[in-house]
């Protein structure tokens, strides 16, 4: 990164937390699933959100940790091992596998801080990489060489 | 969010920026594309990263803005309008559409700050939602009701 001059929030501690709360991945995406109208099943719907119309359909699973920022993360979970047939939208096609697309999300864990003499002094944020699944993708199986 | 006690970074201004730099979506994902081995084309490869094996293959396009945090964002760009046939991996099947999966990424823009009397006083971060495409997904076309 190029160097940026320091910015000017009024309270550094609160700002760090505030920014973090808002800068993380807001999944589920723009078009929310409507579970009552689109029951979770191994089929590709002809309407509804992208994750239910996909031939590698998926649902979102909440991962909540009150000692982590963001406290709420959503993981995609594939509803089928294979892809759904484009012909019918309901039968599976064994020529394709439904695979998760991952990324490493940076998260921050709340940890007790220790002062200069080892005394407990509030909480610090500890940065960690955390694997999150974004979606399921229909792929041709790998050819074993 | 539940209330967290304030945390204890040493310098608030630097910490805000440091946390932001690290908390955004690190795309391209875990398995990097190798463009020389897998030329970008409308076909589903039998090896390589997920975005080249997908029947809705995509490439990543860099979006760099030095006045934004994160400065680098990557957008998925579909390589085919339709899905690639699972039978061959090399010709299109018009029964399926290759659609982008979007999410609203929170970004922060660097803006000049103004002091109490309107004087220029360094830079502030302005939070904005920014639409990013994560991947391409093979979907059954919507049925128009």
């Amino acid at each position: 990164y190029s160097h940026w001059p320091s910015c000017c929030p009024s309270k550094g501690q609160d700002t760090s937390e505030e920014l973090l709360r808002w800068s993380t991945v807001p999944v589920p995406p723009l078009e929310p699933a409507r579970p009552n109208r689109h029951p979770e099943s191994c089929r590709a719907s002809e309407d509804g959100p992208l994750n239910s119309r996909a031939i590698s359909p998926w649902r979102y699973e909440l991962d909540r940790d009150l000692n982590r920022l963001p406290q709420d993360l959503y993981h995609a979970r594939c509803l089928c091992p294979h892809c759904v047939s484009l012909q019918t939208g309901s039968h599976m096609d064994p020529r394709g596998n439904s695979e998760l697309l991952y990324h490493n999300q940076t998260v921050f864990y709340r940890r007790p801080c220790h002062g200069e003499k080892g005394t407990h002094k509030g909480y610090c944020l500890e940065r960690r990489l955390y694997r999150v699944s974004l979606a399921c993708v229909c792929v041709r199986p790998r050819v074993m060489g | 969010y539940s209330h967290w006690p304030s945390c204890c970074p040493s310098k608030g201004q630097d910490t805000s920026e440091e946390l932001l730099r690290w908390s955004t979506v690190p795309v391209p994902p875990l398995e990097p594309a190798r463009p020389n081995r897998h030329p970008e084309s409308c076909r589903a490869s039998e090896d390589g990263p997920l975005n080249s094996r997908a029947i809705s293959p995509w490439r990543y396009e860099l979006d760099r803005d030095l006045n934004r945090l994160p400065q680098d964002l990557y957008h998925a760009r579909c390589l085919c309008p339709h899905c690639v046939s699972l039978q061959t991996g090399s010709h299109m099947d018009p029964r399926g559409n290759s659609e982008l999966l979007y999410h609203n990424q929170t970004v922060f823009y660097r803006r000049p700050c103004h002091g109490e009397k309107g004087t220029h006083k360094g830079y502030c971060l302005e939070r904005r939602l920014y639409r990013v495409s994560l991947a391409c997904v093979c979907v059954r076309p919507r049925v128009m009701g």
């Epitope: 047939s85 019918t88 039968h91 599976m92 | 046939s85 039978q87 090399s90």
Partner: antibody, heavy 121, light 113 residues
Framework: QVQLQESGPGLVKPSETLSLTCTVS????????WSWIRQAPGKGLEWIGF???????NYNPSLKSRVTISVDTSKNQFSLKLNSVTAADTAVYYC???????????????WGQGTLVTVSS | DIVMTQSPASLAVSLGERATINCKSS????????????LAWYQQKPGQPPNLLIY???TRDSGVPDRFSGSGSGADFTLTISSLQAEDVAVYYC?????????FGQGTKVEIK
């Protein structure tokens, strides 16, 4: 009735490139997929790869690094190039057509008569 | 790749008798979406190219005598010649067109006993 005819040199030296052409008569090369298949003496059939009229190709992974198939729609022909040949590439080489029905490729029909290519110095 | 295995490698049958050739695929070639088996049978006479006999595992190509029939589903298939004729002496191949790379069985040679 569509007919296919292979042509090209019957003898190729080791490490050189085998080049064959298939001429399609009695019909257009468009709207179909065109394959090369080979058969070593006394052996079974091995699919090499296919091309469609637009030039989209698909190769057998076992030969992919050495194969190029191209099409010339103006001449109603498609061609095979196989480089770095060895004695193991000695075979009868056939061209054949595949129809596409409901967006999927089907069986091979018809086939060319085949041409024997011998790899020898 | 889908591996196709034929048995027997060769078969000697008396004229007018039944000849049966088996073909197994390493994975199913039945597509449940259209309930079709992506399997074809070819006949190859000496010095000639293969000639299509049967497709979709059981549909005879036009002009193929009805003594030839195909059966089976999923991963196990059979080609039957109900009453062998002299002109049926040939090598027979099964082939899957379920997914690339297209693959053939190693062939079954049918002779007259």
């Amino acid at each position: 009735q569509v007919q296919l005819q292979e042509s090209g040199p019957g003898l190729v030296k080791p490490s050189e490139t085998l080049s064959l052409t298939c001429t399609v008569s009695g019909g257009s090369i468009s709207s179909y997929f065109w394959s090369w298949i080979r058969q070593a003496p006394g052996k079974g059939l091995e699919w090499i790869g296919f091309i469609d009229y637009s030039g989209s190709t698909n190769y057998n992974p076992s030969l992919k690094s050495r194969v190029t198939i191209s099409v010339d729609t103006s001449k109603n022909q498609f061609s095979l190039k196989l480089n770095s040949v060895t004695a193991a590439d000695t075979a009868v080489y056939y061209c054949a057509r595949q129809e596409i029905i409901n967006f999927e490729l089907n069986w091979f029909d018809p086939w060319g008569q085949g041409t024997l290519v011998t790899v020898s110095s | 790749d889908i591996v196709m295995t034929q048995s027997p490698a060769s078969l000697a049958v008396s004229l007018g008798e039944r000849a049966t050739i088996n073909c197994k695929s390493s994975q199913s070639v039945l597509y449940s979406s259209n309930n079709k088996n992506y399997l074809a049978w070819y006949q190859q006479k000496p010095g000639q190219p293969p000639n299509l006999l049967i497709y979709w595992s059981s549909t005879r190509d036009s002009g193929v005598p009805d003594r030839f029939s195909g059966s089976g589903s999923g991963a196990d298939f059979t080609l039957t010649i109900s009453s062998l004729q002299a002109e049926d002496v040939a090598v027979y191949y099964c082939q899957q067109y379920f997914s690339t790379p297209w693959t053939f069985g190693q062939g079954t040679k049918v002779e007259i006993k």
